[in-house]
């Protein structure tokens, strides 16, 4: 089971619920986006394959001072089995390609929706 939610979370959340909540948060970000997300900060693009939750977190954790994605960062940490800190990079990063956080979120959102549709929650 994936354990997600706030610090006051009563217990483990079923993986399907955890994924749905992450999707909901990314939808909120895309819907509420007025000015450029995170002031147009750029992050490393990632390969959306196995291990992409950690890779996504490794990319987004390098964006500081952006409250809009803090909850996403926390939620992604619940899907990643190891501790991630700024400056850490995995082989899943497309190291020659940087994209805006807004595009990163959009790409991640679509991929997560496909995983949800296919019943791949972990």
């Amino acid at each position: 089971l994936t354990c997600l939610g706030g610090f006051a979370s009563p217990g483990p959340v079923p993986p399907s619920t955890a994924l749905r909540e992450l999707i909901e948060e990314l939808v909120n970000i895309t819907q509420n986006q007025k000015a450029p997300l995170c002031n147009g900060s750029m992050v490393w693009s990632i390969n959306l394959t196995a291990g992409m939750y950690c890779a996504a977190l490794e990319s987004l954790i390098n964006v500081s001072g952006c409250s809009a994605i803090e909850k996403t960062q926390r939620m992604l940490s619940g899907f990643c089995p190891h501790k991630v800190s700024a400056g850490q990079f995995s082989s899943l990063h497309v190291r020659d390609t940087k994209i805006e956080v807004a595009q990163f979120v959009k790409d991640l959102l679509l991929h997560l929706k496909k995983l949800f549709r296919e019943g791949q929650f972990n």
């Epitope: 399907s16 749905r20 999707i23 939808v27 959306l48 929706k113 496909k114 949800f116 549709r117 019943g119």
Partner: antibody, heavy 125, light 112 residues
């Protein structure tokens, strides 16, 4: 606007192969699933399989496994369905269709919302 | 495989009447994610099918509100509240919850 344009009618010999194309416009195929459905003359619809063009992952109906190959080329926004070892009962109209999501809903899988015009494949000796 | 069975095979009605088309699945078609991917398609002769309803009861954009879907588990219904001349066609239910995804055999709605 959204369009799926399929290749033209084909007449094939038993035992041969056919490859039908489906050119998409008005959307990015990587954002979708692309499906193939066939319909024999006077019969109902039969789902054959699907591909996620973003990663090439496919799902096939077991009865077609090993005979059907669904591929997609993101660069040309085209999906393909190849059926091998053709027999007379493969004579049918073959349709491509897409399923898409939007950014603004949590759970917005739109089923097969747009379809190609169909490609008649006739298998005859 | 999930077998989708539609009834009746043919339904003869007049414009203005209410049509009720039934679809039954051989097993529960709730997806592991909690959704039920039950869809209805309309097909007219010589044309590609058109999506009417997805996830049991969600009407696709542009579909008139006289079309409605209902049901749960294994029993599903497409209702056309007041038949218009253009509604006479073949209707297929489809399940996209369990691979391989499957269509029903179709119900032909004809003018009485």
């Amino acid at each position: 606007q959204v369009q799926l344009v399929q290749s033209g009618a084909e007449v094939k010999k038993p035992g041969s192969s056919v490859k039908v194309s489906c050119k998409a416009s008005g959307f990015y195929i990587k954002d979708t699933y692309m499906h193939w459905v066939r319909q024999a003359p006077g019969q109902g619809l039969e789902w054959m399989g699907t591909i996620d063009p973003a990663n090439g992952n496919t799902k096939y109906v077991p009865k077609f496994q090993g005979r059907v190959t669904i591929t997609a080329d993101e660069s040309t926004s085209t999906a393909y369905m190849e059926l091998s070892s053709l027999r007379s009962e493969d004579t049918a109209v073959y349709y491509c269709a897409r399923s898409i999501y939007d950014d603004y809903h949590v759970d917005d899988y739109y089923a097969m919302d747009y379809w190609g015009q169909g490609t008649l494949v006739t298998v005859s000796s | 495989d999930v077998l989708m069975t539609q009834s009746p095979g043919t339904l003869s009605l007049s414009p203005g009447e209410r049509a009720t088309l039934s679809c039954r699945s051989s097993q529960n078609i709730v997806h592991i994610n909690g959704n039920t991917y039950l869809e209805w398609y309309q097909q007219k002769p010589g044309q590609a099918p058109k999506l009417l309803i997805y996830k049991i009861s969600d009407r696709f954009s542009g579909v008139p509100d006289r079309f409605s879907g209902s049901g749960s588990g294994t029993d599903f219904t497409l209702t056309i509240s007041r038949l218009e001349p253009e509604d006479f066609a073949v209707y297929y239910c489809f399940q996209g919850s369990h691979v391989p995804w499957t269509f029903g055999q179709g119900t032909k709605l004809e003018i009485k």
